[in-house]
Amino acid sequence: PRSIEVKYIGVKSAYVSYDAEKRTIYLNITNTLNITNNNYYSVEVENITAQVQFSKTVIGKARLNNITNIGPLDMKQIDYTVPTVIAEEMSYMYDFCTLLSIKVHNIVLMMQVTVTTAYFGHSEQISQERYQYVDCGRNTTYQLAQSEYLNVLQPQQ
């Protein structure tokens, strides 16, 4: 079999909300993946599991099941959303993200994603990791996942 390629494109949108009483930040992060099937037969994307880390702590997880079928020599772009919560021992971040004196509140998050594909009863997992900047002070949307350029570090295969 030929390869199935997974390319993490980047953050498509990040929507933020806050709970001042709980000193908690809620970040809904939508990411974009390109999955390319280099085979001459269809491949099933069984599931996508994703997690987001801040400062080595997992702040959000998501799983998508029975996602799509990718035809021979075809590529599909898939968006997935990870709801994240920055709270408790990281509640000090609430002060930073709502700091009145600055307009830009960048934090670095690690996006981890694993794609499970299946063909002819055979399963394969492909993982990617990418560090991304997110502004935790405002909502951000990107045109056509332009955030491909946001890499802090190159992906670790």
């Epitope: 953050v11 009145l100 600055i102 307009k103 830009v104 960048n106 991304q132 502004d135 946001l150």
Partner: antibody, heavy 118, light 113 residues
Framework: EVQLQQSGPVLVKPGPSVKISCMAS????????IHWVKQSHGKSLEWIGL????????NYNQNFKGKATLTVDTSSRTAYMELNSLTSEDSAVYYC???????????WGQGTLVTVSE | DIVMTQSPSSLSVSVGEKVTVSCKSS????????????LAWYQQKPGQPPKLLIY???TRESGVPDRFTGSGSGTDFTLTISSVQAEDLAVYYC?????????FGAGTKLELK
């Protein structure tokens, strides 16, 4: 519909001070920054500063420090701006506006005309 | 403070015409972290408060017609109205949304020919 209801026009003599108000309705007052913006007649917009109702925190434009004082009364969901040492230069329309934290200013009050004249 | 320079200061247009308004900032409005430009465009009609049209340099506010397009990066930005309608006659302001104090351009007045 979201509303920021500002107090009516005021005519004041040069000298002391004037306090104008901005009452919020339909949205969670504590969840937004309230900004104040000055627009002199036929001129552009000047950002005066903002106040965070939740804790009363403020951020002023240096050009208005000492001129404007921003406060809030959360019980009445009202933001106030006091302008002191009034001169004719302070004659303008003053807008209150809101932003969801550091997001852009998305909604504005109708404006309060302040006229400083003998 | 970031200085915002708009041009032209006024523009005489006919309905259906394409219009471009330029805005230059004295410092970059690019958030080098997330690669987003923090610039907003407002429309102000006589006797009314400003209305947010575009933020993040290119994202249209909800309900804004798609004839309004924002573009540009760093220090050079453009607001384009693809086909001007009578209701578009107003003053347009660009605004630095990158750092305090927030600063506005002097405005571009759109008038009917």
């Amino acid at each position: 519909e979201v509303q920021l209801q500002q107090s009516g026009p005021v005519l004041v003599k040069p000298g002391p001070s004037v306090k104008i108000s901005c009452m919020a309705s339909v949205f969670t007052f504590n969840d937004y920054y309230i900004h104040w913006v000055k627009q002199s007649h036929g001129k552009s917009l000047e950002w005066i500063g903002l106040v965070y109702p939740y804790n009363g925190g403020t951020n002023y434009n240096q050009n208005f420090k000492g001129k404007a004082t921003l406060t809030v009364d959360t019980s009445s969901r009202t933001a106030y701006m006091e302008l002191n040492s009034l001169t004719s230069e302070d004659s303008a329309v003053y807008y209150c506006a809101r932003s969801y934290f550091s997001n852009p200013i998305g909604y504005w009050g109708q404006g309060t005309l302040v006229t400083v004249s003998e | 403070d970031i200085v915002m320079t708009q041009s032209p200061s006024s523009l005489s247009v006919s309905v259906g015409e394409k219009v471009t308004v330029s805005c230059k900032s004295s410092q970059s409005l690019l958030n080098s972290g997330n690669q987003k430009n923090y610039l907003a465009w407002y429309q102000q009609k006589p006797g009314q408060p400003p209305k947010l049209l575009i933020y993040g340099a290119s994202t249209r506010e909800s309900g804004v017609p798609d004839r309004f397009t924002g573009s540009g990066s760093g220090t050079d930005f453009t607001l384009t109205i693809s086909s001007v309608q009578a209701e578009d006659l107003a003053v347009y302001y660009c605004q630095n949304d990158h750092s305090y104090p927030l600063t506005f351009g002097a405005g571009t007045k759109l008038e009917l020919k």
